[in-house]
């Protein structure tokens, strides 16, 4: 009896694992084996595919074959018993195009209100992704074990920290990788769960902001308690992307080591041009807080995108706000020759409920205010250029009282 060729051959490539699966064409014939050949582009001869010769099952692994993953290859399969079937040719394919990204490795560390996530590619030193190692981004799904309500976080790098969690609570998450340059989305890792620790005695510093004064950066933060010392560390933001980088190390800013105030000042010139992360930690001598949320700061933008200055004209039911150019040292206005958009936040002095206005104009009306009431206003500038998607810090808050009724003219 003539053997029939196997059918429906599927090539599955995950990272550097090359798996072939196929269907037997004739289930009634026993003791059949299967063999594959392959052919590279531009070659006439077929070569035996090592790892896929005389296979008794309907699956084989040819990961040991050292292929150029960007080069098209063709496969063919036949069945063998006493005689052989005709060859069945599989559509040619390029391994890199066909490859899927495997599940990443995930390692978790718990804090009281945060989880630190270390992500690395599932296949170390992968041949498939050798040229794309630094281009991986990740996304994750996280949920409280008790509730199951999922939150998705997109476009993160190999080291990520999730904040604003609850102490002593179990959180579960899964992570997948993506190579956006090649339109590839990977498969999820197994689910990892971790319990956050008991609440720390000292909270981390909050509301960290960087501004520029004279030739210095001024770093400010808020803290709950008095009589504390603080330290500030920096990291080049690029290092967040690279999991294997042995140079990944947070370092101290000398001017901001063991400072006793909730701000520190350091010269603009100590940093080479680039984007950095900063974090602050508090200590009372015996206990130390966890690190604050990390803030990103760009030396090139920070150096010239200053908070706006503004004047307020108060009426009974509104404020007219006139935004001017920010002032440099010596009280000279800074010319910022790129389009800006202004974010104005205002609130009643006795309340925490903030309202926001976004405006391109430099004269803005804040409507619907109550007469004889103190309102506070702060503003910041954003660049409108998509490539320069940057923001200044907020200006200091200015508080004014509205006029008595019927002075809206």
């Amino acid at each position: 009896k003539n053997l029939k060729s196997p059918q429906k051959v599927e090539v599955d490539i995950i990272d550097d694992n090359f798996i072939l699966r196929w269907n037997r064409s004739d289930e009634s014939v026993g003791n059949v084996t299967f063999s594959f050949d392959y052919q590279k582009t531009g070659m006439d001869n077929w070569i035996k595919l090592s790892g896929c010769q005389n296979i008794t099952s309907t699956k084989c692994n040819f990961s040991s074959l050292k292929l150029n993953v960007y080069e098209e290859i063709k496969l063919r399969i036949r069945a063998e018993k006493e005689n052989t079937s005709s060859w069945y040719e599989v559509d040619s394919f390029t391994p890199f195009r066909k490859a899927q990204i495997g599940p990443p490795e995930v390692h978790l560390e718990a804090e009281d209100k945060a989880i630190v996530i270390h992500i690395s590619p599932g296949t170390k030193d992968s041949v498939m992704w050798a040229l794309d190692g630094l281009s991986f981004t990740y996304s994750l799904v996280i949920w409280k074990n008790s509730s199951g309500v999922e939150e998705r976080i997109e476009n993160i790098y190999s080291r990520h920290k999730i904040y604003k969690l609850s102490p002593e609570t179990t959180y579960c998450l899964k992570v997948k990788a993506a190579l956006l340059t090649s339109w590839k989305i990977g498969v999820y890792s197994p689910v990892h769960c971790i319990k956050t620790t008991v609440e720390n005695e000292l909270p981390p510093p909050e509301n960290i902001e960087v501004s520029v004064q004279n030739q210095n950066y001024v770093l400010k933060w808020d803290y709950t308690y008095a009589n504390m010392t603080f330290q500030v560390q920096w990291l080049h933001a690029f290092l967040k992307r690279n999991p294997g980088n042995h140079l990944y190390k947070w370092k101290q800013i000398p001017d901001c080591e063991n400072v006793k105030t909730t701000q520190c000042v350091f010269p603009q010139n100590v940093f080479q041009k680039g984007i950095y992360l900063l974090r602050v930690q508090a200590s009372d001598g015996n206990n130390t807080s966890f690190w604050s949320e990390e803030i990103k700061f760009d030396t090139e933008i920070q150096a010239f995108l200053l908070p706006p200055v503004f004047n307020i004209r108060s009426l009974s039911d509104s404020f007219h706000i006139y935004i001017g150019a920010p002032k440099q040292s010596g009280n000279t206005p800074v010319i910022q020759d790129y389009p800006l958009i202004y974010e104005i936040i205002f609130w009643e002095n006795t309340s925490n409920a903030e309202r926001k206005i976004i405006e391109k104009k430099t004269d803005v009306t804040v409507p619907n205010l109550k007469p004889l009431t103190v309102y506070c206003v702060k503003a910041r500038a954003h660049t409108m250029d998509e490539k320069l998607n940057k923001s200044s810090v907020f200006s200091d808050a200015v508080c004014e009282k509205t006029k008595p009724g019927n002075t809206s003219k």
Epitope: L134, H236, F238, N245, L247, E257
Partner: antibody
């Protein structure tokens, strides 16, 4: 392991242009900062400038009119060009890496340049 | 530019001794100071940054201290491999500048 290796002509005549190459292995120059520093015969060290991961540059103002630092990311190399050299430019030239502040944790072995007519 | 004055220019010491090299800046450099060791025919090696932080892999017999304009590098219990030249360098403003070096020789 990060390794840097300088290469260059060794000898130049006054008024010529000096071109040096720093080849980096074990690390991509699309991360961090890549500097040039030179050491004169009397052991004085002088900082010359850098090119960053993004291609931005800084030159020591004392050299600004004569210096150019460029890179080729496909070769993982960066370059120093110094125009109109004089005897005063006789020195050992080092390439070095920094991580964001101006101190240098990896250095090349250095290449010696002698300027002489 | 900030000038860095290093002293002594040279010193002789024996294995097991403790030595101190000092560096004075022409202005306050706020601990933005690094120390390097350079052996004959080799490239400089970073020992200390931020005036007192030891670079990874540097033996603990090296220590940096100081503040304002005055800084020092101390080497406890000198080892044969410690002989060579030492340089300080500030990075508080640009351009960064180096000290003129201290040559440490075996007595």
């Amino acid at each position: 392991e990060v390794q840097l290796q300088e290469s260059g002509p060794g000898l130049a005549k006054p008024s010529q242009t000096l071109s040096l190459t720093c080849s980096v292995t074990g690390y991509s120059i699309t991360s961090d900062y890549w500097n040039w520093i030179r050491k004169f015969p009397g052991n004085k060290l002088e900082y010359m400038g850098y090119i960053s991961y993004s291609g931005s540059i800084y030159y020591n103002p004392s050299l600004k009119s004569r210096i150019s630092i460029t890179r080729d990311t496909s070769k993982n190399q960066y370059y120093l060009q110094l125009n109109s050299v004089t005897n005063e430019d006789t020195a050992t030239y080092y390439c070095a890496r920094s991580g964001g502040m101006y101190y240098f944790d990896y250095w090349g072995q250095g290449t010696t340049l002698t300027v002489s007519s | 530019d900030i000038q860095m004055t290093q002293s002594p220019a040279s010193l002789s010491a024996s294995v097991g001794e403790t030595v101190t090299i000092t560096c004075r800046a022409s202005g306050n450099i706020h601990n933005y100071l690094a120390w390097y060791q350079q052996k004959q025919g080799k490239s400089p090696q970073l020992l200390v940054y931020n005036a007192k932080t030891l670079e990874d892999g540097v033996p603990s017999r090296f220590s940096g201290s100081g503040s304002g304009t005055q800084y020092s590098l101390k080497i406890n219990s000198l080892q044969p491999e410690d002989f060579g030249s030492y340089y300080c360098q500030h990075f508080w403003s640009i351009p960064p500048t180096f000290g003129s070096g201290t040559k440490l020789e075996i007595k």
